[in-house]
Interface confidence: medium
């Protein structure tokens, strides 16, 4: 059986939309499937790699690599999207390419960044972990770390940094899929909202879905002990 909830929820474009949340109900009138997984049910994607989920994560990563920061022209906010999802008339799509990206490093200007921009994250403005010396962030945003400390300044002069961020990674469903969404949408969908991250590649949704002890390697499920828990 399914339980359907419909509600007006604030979406990425800053407008309220009618959204449906479909929850698979437990046939035996008990905890939901997500709760059962958290409690240690034998859910194979938490025990070993699931090809389907792996493909989904890789697909999401490929899309994210090509994303940019969509900044609303009315200064209402910005969100990480694909170019096709960013209005050409109402917004500015900040995407580095050819010669528009900043240099990879201050000491060598020949190498320009082509991956990015990312809303509210920039290697030039992050102090921890700083992109410098031996630890220069790669030219692939899906390999960027979470910036835990931004340089203290109200304005950077960069469009993708001086905007109000409207969406962050949200882990939705037992498949561990990730979307950049508003907090409202994420909570309505019973997802896990990552306030600390800017990109889906920075979070490990399956790890969150499975709960219990975190995976040793966030990308590799290893909860074999589930076989004895349930």
């Amino acid at each position: 059986a399914q339980h359907v909830t419909t509600q007006l929820v604030l979406r990425n474009k800053g407008v309220y939309e009618s959204v449906k949340y479909i929850q698979q109900e437990n046939f035996w009138i008990g905890p939901s499937s997500i709760d059962l997984i958290h409690l240690g049910a034998k859910f194979s994607p938490c025990i070993r790699k699931d090809q389907q989920i792996e493909q989904l994560v890789l697909r999401e990563r490929d899309l994210e690599r090509d994303s940019g920061c969509c900044v609303q022209n009315d200064h209402s906010g910005c969100i990480q999207t694909q170019r096709k999802d960013c209005s050409e008339t109402l917004a500015t799509f900040v995407k580095w390419q050819d010669d528009t990206g900043p240099p990879m490093d201050k000491s060598d200007l020949g190498q320009k960044r082509t991956s990015g921009a990312v809303c509210h994250q920039d290697p030039r403005t992050c102090e921890e972990p700083a992109s410098s010396g031996a630890h220069i962030w790669p030219d692939d945003i899906t390999k960027w770390p979470i910036c835990t400390e931004q340089a203290k300044s109200n304005r950077t002069g960069f469009l993708h940094m001086d905007c109000q961020i409207k969406g962050r990674p949200c882990c939705i469903s037992t498949k561990g899929s990730c979307e950049i969404t508003t907090r409202e949408y994420c909570e309505f969908m019973h997802g896990y909202f990552h306030e600390e991250a800017t990109l889906c590649s920075q979070v490990h949704c399956l790890d969150k879905v499975c709960g219990l002890l975190p995976f040793l390697n966030p990308e590799v499920p290893d909860q074999f002990y589930r076989l004895w828990l349930s």
């Epitope: 010669d99 900043p102 201050k106 060598d108 200007l109 030039r124 403005t125 340089a151 300044s153």
Partner: antibody, heavy 122, light 107 residues
Framework: QVTLKESGPGILQPSQTLSLTCSFS??????????VGWIRQSSGKGLEWLAH???????YYNPALKSRLTISKDTSKNQVFLKIANVDAADTATYYC??????????????WGQGTSVTVSS | DIQMTQSPSSLSASLGERVSLTCRAS??????LSWLQQKPDGTIKRLIY???TLDSGVPKRFSGSRSGSDYSLAISSLESEDFADYYC?????????FGSGTKLEIK
């Protein structure tokens, strides 16, 4: 309006440490993408880049002089400092500071100070 | 380090004349080159950056161009205040390096 002004001891003796100050206005080193560099010019010779400090405190030095150079900044006072240890006659020169800008494009050394003359003599 | 070979080392020219100075980079600098003017009193002013972009307030008679690893500064019609020393500067890589300079004298 961006201005930079260098100051130094004028004269000092061999083996001493040269301390130079660059005081600037019209910009702040707490602003992303800005930096200040030091350059010198010995009499009748060309220009030689010495060191650079960026808004995020990242520092670069001329490898040929690195062991003797120390660059630092006081963001609140709008000042950048350069120390050159163990000076000798070859360090006699006019020392300039200049602003640099690092962003999408890179506008190197766009504003220069007037220079300060330093003589190393016993 | 990147070597910048500047020529000529000195140049005598008359008012109204067109002159051209050249810098050659020993390695690829991708257009990260500026031209500086140093007046007899020691003051230094940047004229051009990114090989050909004129700084604001610089007269249009100055122009910069690039051909491969050769970078040129041209002054279309010399005026009295143009007689000075000129240096090229590469800023593609640290350490920044300068050309040896061209002394432009009045004939």
């Amino acid at each position: 309006q961006v201005t930079l002004k260098e100051s130094g001891p004028g004269i000092l003796q061999p083996s001493q440490t040269l301390s130079l100050t660059c005081s600037f206005s019209g910009f702040s080193l707490s602003t992303f993408s800005l930096g200040v560099g030091w350059i010198r010019q010995s009499s009748g010779k060309g220009l030689e880049w010495l060191a650079h400090i960026w808004w995020d405190d990242e520092k670069y030095y001329n490898p040929a002089l690195k062991s003797r150079l120390t660059i630092s900044k006081d963001t609140s006072k709008n000042q950048v400092f350069l120390k050159i240890a163990n000076v000798d006659a070859a360090d006699t020169a006019t020392y300039y500071c200049a602003r640099a800008y690092y962003s999408k494009s890179y506008y190197a050394l766009d504003y220069w100070g007037q220079g300060t003359s330093v003589t190393v003599s016993s | 380090d990147i070597q910048m070979t500047q020529s000529p080392s000195s140049l005598s020219a008359s008012l109204g004349e067109r002159v051209s100075l050249t810098c050659r980079a020993s390695q690829e600098i991708s257009g990260y080159l500026s031209w500086l003017q140093q007046k007899p009193d020691g003051t230094i002013k940047r004229l051009i950056y990114a090989a050909s972009t004129l700084d604001s307030g610089v007269p249009k008679r100055f122009s910069g161009s690039r051909s491969g690893s050769d970078y040129s500064l041209a002054i279309s019609s010399l005026e009295s205040e143009d007689f000075a020393d000129y240096y090229c500067l590469q800023y593609a890589n640290f350490p920044f390096t300068f050309g040896s300079g061209t002394k432009l004298e009045i004939k």
